[in-house]
Interface confidence: low
């Protein structure tokens, strides 16, 4: 089979027939050097998954539950292309599983025990697997058989397709539990009718069900959604209040050598020629031989899944948790009102050493997880492998887009009630050598630049945002002659000045010597023309305050700031000569860990914060010899956010807008993946 062949896996005679037709029609429209289709027939989806893993086939389209199976070892498949529904302009690749209740019913998600429940059907995603998976650890023991545990949890249910003889409580609200539309409470609309009629207290459906059944907004306003954080929201706020976000139908391939680009090329060309309303003789999204063959008949087209997205990220933390609970049936030993250890994400070797020291000193309250880049850390927090880390504002933005929330802010100024008063922020500055007297903000083109890292606030988002407004393109590697911006593409001119050795060159972690505030300033000292850092960086690394050989003899007076009006000022005049005010670094976590991270970190800073006077013999949370490990070294305390508890509110409208503008220039594969899940 030539290399440009995609071997599609079919699971029935009808699918195999459609696959052959797909193959023949593609041959007629695609040049001979383009992608082609071959068909492989297997008995089931699980057999297809195994065949792809074994390199006997390349692709198959799966429902969300099977995407989870495909991801599990030893299969290790990943999503590569998503079907979308609705219009090309507003493509829907996911639906939201929600818990709908009547407005005046007055209970929350953690108070469902003893209520009456309406389900779309036993074993169905939104109506059963997701809600029951998420409630699994609240079900009374023994939790097997599952139907019995559910029957004992709710005071009565309608769960179509359940066995009414063995589990009569599951059919209490719909006698007989009929498994078709003959049962008025079957399916999405049926489960909603069960709630509407007053038979049940809660209906587990998908977000569109309410809109499909109630055209009138005034009628919809009589209902609310239960959120996982034990609040309620209006039914149109399903994106912020759901049980899980579920992909509809997805093409999977091998994670390694999986031909994902070829599969996309094939399907993209296929939708051009044979998509909705394109061709009479062959249609990708319908078939005379049966329903939903190879692809869903209701699909309108395909979207490429961003390459950074593995199955865990694609399915989402809530969905994976629900399905894992159902499949594995394991629940934590700790009582639910007690906090489990917080798993801190540490970047590379240096942070891990400090984190391990913290872990030992915390006596089991902190555990450590390692990752090579900040984005890898954010991904680990998203999928539950880690719980928290402190981030620069640029990454708070990405984390926020990925569904994480800020919990505490680093404060850098000593004050009486430090923990109660989050600060307005710090200043992002452009530093130059005093000796380069002709250099101004207006003539930086062609100069050598030093950045903390791509995507960070003072080192990238603020200066590059301002620059973008001036040059109106993203080709910053053309604007500067060379530079060090850790996280850039390795062959970019913005990696040329970096000092990391081998694979560590230009890496966005401490293995790259020019990474971070101190690193960017060192880059200026040794090689560059301008460094983009925070206002405290120069004083923290001059006048003998940084004992490292490169810094120990530096004098603050030898450096100046570039002002946006084209003038220059001494370093201490940062308040009147800066690029913008930057939001302080903040600790982020998942919504479900917010309370525990807040509680444990406040305990930890009371034990190891700035009140510790001697850091030579004791562990100090906010010290690391100017390396800014885990937290910035100038942190005085971690402060409560009060009502600034979302990434937008924390960062502020102006900064969110600035980073939003730079989105056109974003090289963040994680941001691309997260905005695929939530545009």
């Amino acid at each position: 089979v030539p290399d440009k062949t995609v071997r599609w896996c079919a699971v029935s005679e009808h699918e195999a027939t459609k696959c052959q037709s797909f193959r023949d029609h593609m041959k007629s429209v695609i040049p001979s050097d383009g992608p082609s289709v071959a068909c492989v027939k297997k008995a089931s989806y699980l057999d297809c998954i195994r065949a792809i893993a074994a390199n006997e086939a390349d692709a198959v389209t799966l429902d969300a539950g099977l995407v989870y199976d495909a991801y599990l070892a030893p299969n290790n498949l990943k999503p590569v292309v998503a079907e979308f529904y609705g219009s090309k302009e507003d493509p829907q690749t996911f639906y939201y599983a929600v818990a709908v209740v009547k407005k005046d019913s007055g209970f929350q998600m953690n108070q469902l025990r003893g209520k009456k429940s309406c389900h779309t059907g036993l074993g169905r995603s939104a109506g059963w697997n997701i809600p029951i998976g998420l409630l699994y650890c609240d079900l009374p023991e023994p939790r097997k058989p599952l139907e019995k545990a559910v029957a004992n949890f709710f005071s009565g249910s309608c769960a179509p397709c359940a066995d009414g003889t063995d589990f009569p409580q599951l059919c209490q609200l719909c006698p007989g539990c009929g498994c078709s539309t003959l049962n008025q409470y079957f399916g999405y609309s049926g489960a909603f009718k069960c709630l509407k009629d007053g038979a049940g207290d809660v209906a587990f459906v998908k977000h569109s069900t309410i809109f499909e059944n109630l055209a009138n907004k005034a009628d919809r306003d009589q209902y609310e959604l239960l959120c996982l954080d034990n609040t309620r929201k209006p039914v149109d706020e399903y994106k912020d209040c759901h049980l899980a976000q579920v992909p509809s139908h997805t093409v999977v391939a091998r994670s390694m050598g999986g031909k994902e680009d070829l599969i996309w090329e094939l399907l993209n060309q296929a939708q051009e020629h044979f998509g909705k309303d394109k061709s009479k003789e062959f249609q990708l999204f319908s078939s005379p031989h049966g329903k939903d063959l190879l692809f869903k008949d209701s699909a309108h087209g395909f979207l490429k899944v961003p390459p950074r997205m593995d199955a865990k990220m694609y399915l989402g933390y809530e969905y994976v948790t629900a399905i894992r609970n159902l499949r594995e049936g394991t629940c934590p030993e700790a009582p639910t009102d007690e906090c489990k250890p917080v798993k801190w994400c540490a970047l590379s070797h240096h942070e891990r050493l400090k984190c391990d020291e913290w872990s030992v000193n915390s006596v089991g309250k902190i555990e450590c997880v390692s990752a090579e880049t900040t984005e890898d850390c954010i991904a680990k927090i998203m999928n539950g492998e880690a719980d928290a880390m402190s981030l620069d504002g640029g990454f708070v933005y990405i984390a926020g887009k990925c569904g994480l929330v800020p919990v505490l802010a680093e404060n850098y100024n000593k004050s009486d009630n430090c923990e109660d008063t989050p600060e307005a922020g710090y200043f992002a500055i452009a530093v130059v050598k005093k000796s380069a007297s002709d250099l101004t903000w207006d003539n930086l083109k062609g100069k050598k630049s030093c950045h903390t890292a791509v995507g960070r606030t003072a080192g990238w988002n603020i200066p590059m945002g301002l620059l973008y407004n001036k040059i109106n393109h993203c080709r910053f590697d053309e604007f500067f002659s060379e530079g060090c911006a850790p996280g850039s593409k390795k062959d970019s001119s913005l990696c040329k000045l970096c000092m990391g050795s081998g694979l560590n060159l230009c890496e966005p972690n401490n293995k790259e010597g020019y990474y971070g505030y101190t690193g960017a300033f060192r880059c200026l000292v040794e090689k560059g023309d301008v460094a983009f850092v925070k206002h405290q960086t120069v004083p923290q690394n001059t006048g003998g305050k940084n004992p490292d050989p490169w810094a120990k003899n530096l004098n603050e007076k030898d450096y100046e700031l570039l002002c946006l009006d084209g003038t220059r000022k001494p370093v201490e005049e940062y308040a009147n000569c800066h690029l913008a005010r930057a939001p302080n670094h903040a600790v982020v976590t998942r919504k479900d860990k917010e309370a525990c991270v807040h509680k444990i970190l406040r305990q930890q800073q009371h034990l190891f914060g700035s009140n510790v006077t001697d850091c030579s013999g004791n562990f100090c949370l906010f010290r690391s010899e100017t390396k800014d490990l885990l937290f910035r070294d100038d942190t005085v305390c971690l402060a409560k956010l009060h009502d600034r508890n979302t990434y937008e509110k924390y960062l502020g409208e102006e900064y969110v807008k600035a980073v939003g503008n730079l989105r056109k220039c974003s090289t963040s594969s994680l941001l691309e993946a997260c905005t695929f899940r939530r545009p």
């Epitope: 219009s87 302009e89 507003d90 040059i471 109106n472 393109h473 080709r475 590697d477 053309e478 593409k489 970019s492 969110v656 807008k657 939003g660 503008n661 056109k664 545009p679």
Partner: antibody, heavy 120, light 113 residues
């Protein structure tokens, strides 16, 4: 599907201000993309005027910056062009358009255009 | 400001003929980092607004017939219609989006004999 519709006066006197509205249906202007104004002179020459991004950020053609602004009303899903101190040189068909995000500035949806004559 | 020069300014062809029009840029529109040419082609039929045909110099917009082909790199670009149909009677414009502000060519008017 996405549709854009321009509206505004057909005739404006010199030195007055010109205000045009673009009403977008089928897509929220805060959800993504940049939303542009372009004009076409009677001799068919096309000139890009500026855009407002979904985030609210604006960008204008340097030749018109001083007498030109683009604003929006997100509740009505509309964006606006205001051109001050018009002269007969501003007689043109004015189009609103959306860019394809990738690539930026390549307009994949256009309104049908509204013709404005500047004359006393 | 980048200037785009289109030629010819007009041409008349018979249905079924192949037609080629060119667009020259005053500076290169090729960005070395991603090897993409920042050029688009539009078709404007009489009394209608422009319609995007080609972007990145050679990528056809969804729904555009494959008789339209964009080619070229750097400063010289070509739009080819392999077999002209009567409905192709239009003015064709090139547009650069490499450098701010984006600019358009003066157009090539295609007439049918």
């Amino acid at each position: 599907s996405v549709q854009l519709q321009e509206s505004g006066p057909d005739l404006v006197k010199p030195s007055q201000s010109l205000s045009l509205t673009c009403t977008v249906t089928g897509y929220s202007i805060t959800s993504g993309y940049s939303w542009h104004w372009i004009r076409q002179f009677p001799e068919n020459k096309l000139e890009w005027l500026g855009y407002i991004h979904s985030s609210g950020a604006t960008n204008y053609s340097p030749s018109l910056k001083s007498r030109f602004s683009i604003t929006r009303d997100t509740s009505k899903n509309q964006f606006f062009l205001q051109l001050n101190s018009v002269t007969t040189e501003d007689t043109a068909t004015y189009y609103c358009a959306r860019d394809g995000y990738s690539p930026p500035y390549a307009m994949d949806y256009w309104g049908q255009g509204t013709t404005v004559t500047v004359s006393s | 400001v980048i200037e785009l020069t289109q030629s010819p300014s007009s041409l008349a062809v018979s249905v079924g003929e192949k037609v080629t029009m060119t667009c020259k840029s005053s500076q290169s529109l090729l960005y070395s980092t991603n090897q993409k040419n920042y050029l688009a082609w539009y078709q404007q039929k009489p009394g209608q607004s422009p319609k995007l045909l080609i972007y990145w110099a050679s990528t056809r917009e969804s729904g555009v017939p494959d008789r339209f082909t964009g080619s070229g790199s750097g400063t010289d670009f070509t739009l080819t219609i392999s077999s002209v149909k009567a409905e192709d009677l239009s003015v064709y414009y090139c547009q650069q989006y490499y450098s701010y502000p984006p600019t358009f060519g003066s157009g090539t008017k295609l007439e049918i004999k």
